[in-house]
């Protein structure tokens, strides 16, 4: 009786992992052994497909193959008992075309409020993703374990830490990786869970918000109790992008730490241009608490981001500002490459119910004025970034006088 | 494989100093912190402290400061500790240890003794 | 400086047996737990990291649970290589910290 060529193959490919599955084409002839052979792109030879010789099962694995990912690869399959099937020849296909990316490994760190989550590669030193490494995002679901109510979570890098949980509160979660270069999203992990600490005693620093004065950065944060210590730690960004590495070098501001007050003053060349993340620990010598949220900070929108400098054109009923970019120190003014929106803040000399525009626009009108009556402006530019939410401190405060009441025209 | 060596042991006298080594192989010291622990003999674990072999930024325990200095050298992948103004409570086992992903201390050399004895 | 405080400090135990050895925390230190093993004359070898995970290589009859200010190591039944000492140590903040030991002694 003649063999019939096994049908229906399917490559499954999960990182490095590469899977063949067959269905038999005749089931009642038994102690069929299956064979495969594959084909470079280019050449004419067929080769025997190691780990998928005589295989008396319907799957196998060519892991151990070591092909080029980016390279056009044909396979074919054969059933052999005495006599031979007719190879079934399978699609042309491009490893990394294929591939799909397997779960990552997930490590959790509790506090009382807050979860690290550390995320690798599923696969160690893949060969799969080797030119990929650094274009991994992930994406995670959270849940309280008694709730199950979801929360979603994109684009995250290797190490994450999502704050303001509950004490004692059992948290689940799943994570999945993307190359959306490839437009390849992964799979999920399994899922899991951790309990975040009983609360601790000291809570951690609130707020931080870094401004510039002269030549400093001024690094201001909220503090609940009074006679505590504070250290200030800094992170490149970029490492929290370094997949497989887990041990994250935080360097301590030399003039931020064991401060007594809640703010410290370092100079700007601390820094070189960059992006970072800060972070804000308290201490009364007996406790320390866990580490504040971390900010980001840009030293390149940080340090130009300065008040802008605007001239008033009194009318009777409206003010015309005209927003300029701000002056250095030298009276250089400074380029902002960056899209902002200003706040402008205004009211009567005389009262303190303030009045607020925000305006793209850098020529902005004041409208519903009184003849004759001194009212102040302040502003602020705010940049319109979301993830780099990042606002200057307000201008010193012009005050003017509207004209009489025939100059509206 | 990672592995690190230490230098042999020591006898020293009382108010001398000490220089113990402890040289990585199998990594890049550079990416990794280097811990100094001490086990006095028949007594539990002390952190004395650590370095950051990429920019020498050190940590030492409060009891150690002063006392302890930690260097290394990234060209030949070895830290040291130097130990001065020695007593008679400084005899013990010195070990080092890497410091890997999640700040454990995963790699551990295989000690080296320091007698303090006039 | 954070204390942890281990116990008990000594364990007659049979193989077989089950162990547990418990690490209390002067203070909250979330799961920045270490446990190691120490046999008499050799280093101090990693068994369980970030209180619960176990280092590759390192038999599942070892775990570790807890957080906070409460830790603990179970070995769920003792094998004759078992015998020697552990310490917790956290790596919250520093100094580091350790527990003074717990000796695993044959019954």
């Known amino acids: 009786k003649n063999l019939k060529s096994p049908q229906k193959v399917e490559v499954d490919i999960i990182d490095d992992n590469f899977i063949l599955r067959w269905n038999r084409s005749d089931e009642s002839v038994g102690n069929v052994t299956f064979s495969f052979d594959y084909q470079k792109t280019g050449m004419d030879n067929w080769i025997k497909l190691s780990g998928c010789q005589n295989i008396t099962s319907t799957k196998c694995n060519f892991s151990s193959l070591k092909l080029n990912v980016y390279e056009e690869i044909k396979l074919r399959i054969r059933a052999e008992k005495e006599n031979t099937s007719s190879w079934y020849e399978v699609d042309s296909f491009t490893p990394f075309r294929k591939a799909q990316i397997g779960p990552p490994e997930v490590h959790l760190e509790a506090e009382d409020k807050a979860i690290v989550i550390h995320i690798s590669p599923g696969t160690k030193d893949s060969v799969m993703w080797a030119l990929d490494g650094l274009s991994f995002t992930y994406s995670l679901v959270i849940w309280k374990n008694s709730s199950g109510v979801e929360e979603r979570i994109e684009n995250i890098y290797s190490r994450h830490k999502i704050y303001k949980l509950s004490p004692e509160t059992t948290y689940c979660l799943k994570v999945k990786a993307a190359l959306l270069t490839s437009w390849k999203i992964g799979v999920y992990s399994p899922v899991h869970c951790i309990k975040t600490t009983v609360e601790n005693e000291l809570p951690p620093p609130e707020n931080i918000e870094v401004s510039v004065q002269n030549q400093n950065y001024v690094l201001k944060w909220d503090y609940t109790y009074a006679n505590m210590t504070f250290q200030v730690q800094w992170l490149h960004a970029f490492l929290k992008r370094n997949p497989g590495n887990h041990l994250y070098k935080w360097k301590q501001i030399p003039d931020c730490e064991n401060v007594k007050t809640t703010q410290c003053v370092f100079p700007q060349n601390v820094f070189q241009k960059g992006i970072y993340l800060l972070r804000v620990q308290a201490s009364d010598g007996n406790n320390t608490s866990f580490w504040s949220e971390e900010i980001k900070f840009d030293t390149e929108i940080q340090a130009f981001l300065l008040p802008p400098v605007f001239n008033i054109r009194s009318l009777s009923d409206s003010f015309h500002i005209y927003i300029g970019a701000p002056k250095q120190s030298g009276n250089t003014p400074v380029i902002q490459d960056y899209p902002l929106i200003y706040e402008i803040i205004f009211w009567e000399n005389t009262s303190n119910a303030e009045r607020k525009i925000i305006e793209k626009k850098t020529d902005v009108t004041v409208p519903n004025l009184k003849p004759l009556t001194v009212y102040c402006v302040k502003a602020r530019a705010h940049t319109m970034d979301e993830k780099l939410n990042k606002s200057s401190v307000f201008s010193d405060a012009v005050c003017e006088k509207t004209k009489p009441g025939n100059t509206s025209k | 494989q990672v592995q690190l060596v230490q230098s042999g042991a020591e006898v020293v006298k009382p108010g001398a100093s000490v220089k113990l080594s402890c040289k990585g192989s199998?990594?890049?010291?550079?990416?990794?912190?280097m811990h100094w622990v001490k086990q006095a003999p028949g007594q539990g674990l002390e952190w004395i402290g650590r370095?950051?072999?990429?920019?020498?930024?050190?940590k030492y325990a409060p009891k150690f400061q002063g006392r302890a200095t930690i260097t290394a050298d990234t060209s030949t992948s070895t830290a040291y500790l130097e130990l001065s103004s020695l007593r008679s409570e400084d005899t013990a086992v010195y070990y080092c240890?890497?410091?890997?992903?999640?700040?454990?201390?995963?790699?551990w050399g295989q000690g080296t003794l320091v007698t303090v004895s006039s | 400086d954070i204390q942890m405080t281990q116990s008990p400090s000594f364990l007659s135990t049979s193989v077989g047996d089950r162990v547990t050895v418990t690490c209390k925390a002067s203070?909250?230190?979330?799961?920045?737990v270490v446990w190691y093993q120490q046999k008499p004359g050799k280093s101090p070898k990693v068994l369980i990291y970030s209180a619960s995970y176990r280092v590759s290589g390192v038999p599942s009859r070892f775990s570790g649970s807890g957080s906070g200010t409460e830790f603990t190591l179970i070995i769920s039944s003792v094998q004759p290589e078992d015998f020697a000492t552990y310490f917790c140590q956290q790596k919250n903040n520093y100094p580091y910290t350790f527990g003074q030991g717990t000796k695993l002694e044959i019954k």
């Open positions: 199998g990594f890049n010291i550079k990416d990794y912190y």
């Open positions: 370095i950051d072999p990429e920019d020498a930024e050190t």
């Open positions: 203070q909250n230190v979330g799961t920045n």
């Open positions: 240890a890497r410091g890997g992903n999640f700040y454990v201390m995963d790699y």
